[in-house]
Interface confidence: low
């Protein structure tokens, strides 16, 4: 049974150019975390995987940096990096767990975090 | 359900083009992505490549690059694969299917299949 | 392109009886596998993703394993109704990439 619950940033924004942190937090299971997958809809930006540490898809290499921790930071970013981003988390014995963060990058300096939220 | 209606059988001539259809039912289009699936007479399976709704991108097997076609309605849920410049090598079952939630990245859902005849 | 070897090409089985069906990846993965079943003249059908993941509906006696770049599916007891073609496929990079397939018929 899948007792954990996945924390986000939720809804976040940052200015055109600058930088975010995605993170995501796994909580509430003694499930071992096997795998992190970060990916857009239609995209894998990066995985860490337990065994074999950070991978960063070779189109993403030069504006995605790994960490801190299980999350990922994006570099130089731009309007067209707006959009979800999903943190999957693979298990082991639950299965896996998915948390969604939506980023809206800003022309302007008006860029604010959103409150956080959860992900059964 | 989720059901996925693809176009009827054809016949066509070397040289010719061929537009197949894909209508998608029971689901939101625009929330996944629809591959395109190849397979000759008693052999494997072939991908040709995939096509986000949404945001409109295409990934194509560099195979098919010149070949197939991929576009999308998001008004009538349909995606749709244009054959071009056919010969005997394109007589094949064509299969469109679903790619599933973001965290599968596969096919769940599939179409029943297109028949492709290539002959003079 | 990432290579994908299946074995073995076809076996058959008796009812009851474990077969495991093997896919090898030319490259590291990272459980980025699937495995499809497609019984005659019907579409392939999805059984597992993410290297262990069983898909909706599926029975029980199907299940996977593996890791890196070698993957496995076994089925706990061959039923009559197994006898398909079973096809590994990589999703990790483009162009996806499917295994030869395995013929697997009842003894």
């Known amino acids: 049974m899948m007792t954990g619950t996945i924390e986000t940033t939720g809804n976040i924004s940052a200015e055109k150019g600058g930088s975010i942190i995605l993170q995501c937090h796994l909580s509430s299971t003694t499930a071992q975390v096997t795998q992190v997958n970060w990916e857009q809809q239609d995209q894998l930006l990066a995985i860490c995987n337990a065994d074999l540490g950070w991978h960063i898809s070779p189109s993403f290499k030069d504006r995605v940096a790994p960490g801190p921790g299980l999350g990922l930071t994006l570099q130089s970013l731009t309007v067209n990096d707006t959009g979800e981003y999903f943190c999957i988390y693979h298990t082991y014995p639950d299965g896996t767990y998915t948390g969604r963060i939506f980023l809206e990058v800003l022309e302007s300096s008006v860029a604010e975090h959103g409150a956080r939220f959860q992900i059964p | 359900q989720v059901q996925l209606q693809e176009s009827g059988a054809e016949l066509a001539r070397p040289g010719a083009s061929v537009k197949l259809s894909c209508k998608a039912s029971?689901?939101?289009?625009?929330?996944?992505?629809i591959s395109w699936v190849k397979q000759r007479t008693g052999q494997g399976l072939e991908w040709i490549g995939e096509i986000y709704p949404r945001s409109g991108n295409t990934y194509y097997n560099e195979k098919f690059k010149g070949k197939a076609t991929l576009t999308a309605d998001k008004s009538s849920s349909t995606a749709y694969m244009e054959l071009s410049s056919l010969t005997s090598e394109d007589s094949a079952v064509y299969f469109c299917a679903r790619k599933g939630p973001y965290y599968t990245k596969n096919e769940d859902y599939w179409g029943q299949g297109t028949i492709l005849t290539v002959s003079s | 392109d990432i290579q994908m070897t299946q074995s073995p090409a076809s076996l058959a089985a008796s009812v009851g009886e474990t077969v495991t069906i093997t896919c090898r990846a030319s490259e590291h993965i990272y459980y980025s596998l699937a495995w499809y079943q497609q019984k005659q003249g019907k579409s392939p059908q999805l059984l597992i993703y993410?290297?262990?993941s069983l898909e909706d509906g599926v029975p029980s006696r199907f299940s996977g394993s593996g890791s890196g770049t070698q993957y496995s599916m076994k089925i706990n007891s061959m039923q009559p109704e197994d006898t398909a073609t079973y096809f590994c496929k990589q999703a990790y990079d483009v162009p996806r990439t499917f295994g030869g397939g395995t013929k697997l018929e009842i003894k």
């Open positions: 029971g689901y939101t289009f625009t929330s996944y992505g």
């Open positions: 993410n290297a262990n």
